[in-house]
């Protein structure tokens, strides 16, 4: 378990139930950095403080997640708390300009190829899926594939529908997507590489 | 009531960097976001950052990352952004806004008057 | 960056009528929208949060609506004091974005 994670739940688990609430209404609009999602609200109003460090650790990652945490409490006027999180995480205050992200700290697992070892983040992260699906297409996917995945309404779900074909794909079909992925975010891959 | 003061205007020689000033009163500066806007003339508003005074967190824009740096004294309730190494294009009006920690929306409930920057030697 | 998109640069209306001022996001933002009025010479002024709730002291003539991509500032009953320039700003992702501004004039 990272320190960034236990950190965020610390911070959590210290808020008041009213807090905490106010905490999750706050993550609903406070501003994220280019390429990340937003927590669904349905899902995010029923969390409590373990489920929520998940979600945020799962979404944004470690260090990213421990900056966005802080950034709320520091919007609910909690700048102690705010503090202590970035303290424990090493952080220091206004390190980074949004959009500059340190390395996250979760372990990757090993034996298993980037794609698979990161697939939450990519649902959730991946931004530019149509120039994914050009540069696989005829290589990897179908015509059939093709099309199912451009159907989808949403980058997430079209990166879940992704996700589906890839059990049948051998290394060199997931390497072909990660060099999709690096030519199109590469920033993206880069913080995934160094966690 | 709450303000935040600037001055009217600014001449400053290209190159030769300047301090814009921002001074809160009528509310608690170390509990909401400061953040600063510019807009061109006939133009549109551009957002540069925002600090947090308490601890002077900021997020900026990476379009102004090598141009602007925002710094507090909390001790005077004022915000400042150094515009360094200006150019024609700076020339513009600098707004300081507020964020309003009550509010959960990032949108800016106060705003200063602004300050007329204009560079020309 | 999200772009911001308002297509009216300028809009002609006369006292009393209703007009619709529209602005688009180059994705998805939920709710996550302002809007400002600026008068000529002035700092601009809140109107609306999270795309439809009004702003202290804002009157019930302002109406925000949308979500997602595409977002209107609606105003009816339109006083000679609202012709000004009227912003939209979203805040779901950094850099913070505005659109260019539309600007309501007398036909």
């Known amino acids: 378990m990272g320190r960034a994670r236990d950190a965020i739940l610390d911070a959590l688990e210290n808020l008041t139930a009213e807090e905490l609430k106010k905490f999750k209404l706050k993550l609903l609009s406070v501003p994220l950095r280019e390429g990340y999602g937003r927590i669904p609200r349905g899902a995010l109003l029923s969390m409590d403080a373990l489920d929520l460090t998940d979600k945020l650790v799962s979404f944004y990652l470690e260090t990213y997640g421990a900056e966005l945490t802080a950034n709320v409490l520091r919007d609910m006027g909690l700048q102690e708390m705010a503090g202590q999180l970035q303290a424990a995480t090493h952080q220091g205050s206004g390190a980074a300009p949004a959009g500059i992200q340190a390395p996250p700290q979760s372990a990757a697992k090993p034996g298993l190829h980037f794609i698979d070892q990161h697939r939450a983040a990519l649902i959730a992260r991946v931004t530019n899926v149509e120039w994914l699906l050009d540069a696989l297409y005829g290589k990897v996917l179908t015509d059939e594939q093709y099309q199912a995945v451009r159907a989808e309404p949403t980058n997430p779900s079209k990166m879940r529908k992704l996700f589906s074909f890839t059990p049948a794909w051998n290394w060199t079909c997931k390497d072909l997507l990660l060099q999709a992925l690096r030519e199109s975010q590469s920033y993206l891959v880069e913080d995934l590489e160094r966690s | 009531q709450v303000q935040l003061q600037q001055p009217g205007a600014e001449l400053v020689r290209p190159g030769a960097s300047v301090i814009l000033s921002c001074k809160a009163s009528g509310y608690t500066f170390t509990s909401s976001w400061i953040t600063w806007v510019k807009q061109r003339p006939g133009q549109g508003l551009e957002w540069i950052g925002n600090?947090?005074?308490?601890?002077?967190?900021?997020n900026s824009n990476q379009k102004f990352k090598d141009k602007a740096t925002l710094t507090v004294d909390k001790s005077s309730s004022t915000a400042y952004m150094h515009l360094i190494s200006p150019t024609s294009e700076d020339s513009a009006v600098y707004y300081c806004t507020r964020k309003d920690f009550v509010y959960d929306a990032w949108y800016f409930d106060v705003w200063g008057a602004g300050t007329t920057v204009t560079v020309s030697s | 960056d999200i772009v911001m998109t308002q297509s009216q640069k300028f809009m002609s209306t006369s006292v009393g009528d209703r007009v619709t001022v529209t602005c688009k996001a180059s994705q998805n933002v939920g709710t996550n929208v302002a809007w400002y009025q600026q008068r000529p010479g002035q700092s601009p002024k809140p109107l609306i949060y999270?795309?439809?709730y009004r702003n202290s002291g804002v009157p019930d003539r302002f109406t925000g609506s949308g979500s997602g991509t595409d977002f209107t500032l609606t105003i009816t009953n339109v006083q000679s004091e609202d012709l000004a320039e009227y912003f939209c700003?979203?805040?779901?992702?950094?850099?913070?974005?505005f659109g260019a501004g539309t600007k309501l004039e007398l036909k």
């Open positions: 700003q979203q805040y779901n992702n950094y850099p913070l974005t």
């Open positions: 999270s795309a439809s």
């Open positions: 600090i947090y005074p308490s601890d002077s967190y900021t």
